[in-house]
């Protein structure tokens, strides 16, 4: 068990803070909830603290919760491939470019680390080149979320990882908006981290609303499990 993994044996409170600017539309979001890495479970509620969110909530899911991939459930035989927990408590910087097909792009940069007993994800997001009447600024996405696989590989040169995946957002007219994600994670501290063999995270997300919440918000339930590395031969013959 890595030193960082020991911090995730129970339920951990999570705080998320985002400052965003998309095509000049500035906004802030605060989120809170908890994560339980034993089950790969996240429960979070996000509120736009600046009024109405200028982009659809589903376009921010990867920035919020795929930001705290340290809550992914890594099966026993894959624990030596869990970069995310091994970087804790000092944490990691997570950077992404997200290309929305036939539309603009987001760049995000986040610091994910422990502050006391709370896992904090502090994010900046800059969006450019979006069409004012497109699927994103035109709010044409359905309020739901598909399952995805998130592919992880080691970046030995930077003592971190690179991550690629393609999100499929459902559009109200029945079509799909693709969002290509290119991610890199770099440890904040200088201590040793686990550099993984290639594998993937399998994610399932459910979006809902709080009937008692008047502000623009999103409630998120997510399950994430690591997969893609088989048991060693010694395991097979036990």
């Amino acid at each position: 068990m890595s030193k960082g993994e020991e911090l995730f044996t129970g339920v951990v409170p999570i705080l998320v803070e985002l400052d965003g600017d998309v095509n000049g539309h500035k906004f802030s979001v605060s989120g809170e909830g908890e994560g339980d890495a034993t089950y790969g479970k996240l429960t979070l509620k996000f509120i736009c603290t600046t009024g109405k969110l200028p982009v659809p909530w589903p376009t921010l899911v990867t920035t919020f919760s795929y930001g705290v991939q340290c809550f992914s459930r890594y099966p026993d035989h894959m624990k030596q491939h869990d970069f995310f927990k091994s970087a804790m408590p000092e944490g990691y910087v997570q950077e992404r470019t997200i290309f929305f097909k036939d539309d603009g792009n987001y760049k995000t940069r986040a610091e994910v680390k422990f502050e006391g007993d709370t896992l904090v994800n502090r994010i900046e997001l800059k969006g450019i080149d979006f069409k004012e009447d497109g699927n994103i600024l035109g709010h044409k996405l359905e309020y739901n979320y598909n399952s995805h696989n998130v592919y992880i590989m080691a970046d030995k040169q930077k003592n971190g990882i690179k991550v690629n995946f393609k999100i499929r957002h459902n559009i109200e007219d029945g079509s799909v908006q693709l969002a290509d994600h290119y991610q890199q994670n770099t440890p904040i501290g200088d201590g040793p981290v686990l550099l993984p063999d290639n594998h993937y995270l399998s994610t399932q997300s459910a979006l809902s609303k709080d009937p008692n919440e008047k502000r623009d918000h999103m409630v998120l339930l997510e399950f994430v499990t690591a997969a893609g590395i088989t048991h060693g031969m010694d395991e097979l013959y036990k």
Epitope: D19, D21, V93, R109, G160
Partner: nanobody, 115 residues
Amino acid sequence: DVQLQESGGGLVQPGGSLRLSCAASGIVFSIYDMGWHRQAPGKQRELVASITSGKNTNYADSVLGRLTISRDNSKNTVYLQMNSLKPEDTAVYYCNARSLLYDYWGQGTQVTVSS
């Protein structure tokens, strides 16, 4: 309230060394690209060295091999180690912090290389 506080400047002889520090407060330091710029009297401000949030470094041709930029995220501080200093390195050195959304500057620290 955001502050970038430079220190470590001074008078040094040619061939000597200095270590500049820039302590940041009021920002999420680790997600900022940090840079050292300098401005000599009567000249434009120029980028000397930079280090990204992902710890990639970049240097002006004129300082390659003599200056080294580094960062300590646990101390919210960026450093500039200056070796083999030359009279033409004389300038006010400014610390810059730039993120996706924000851009901040320090007040500067004077470096004078003279015999």
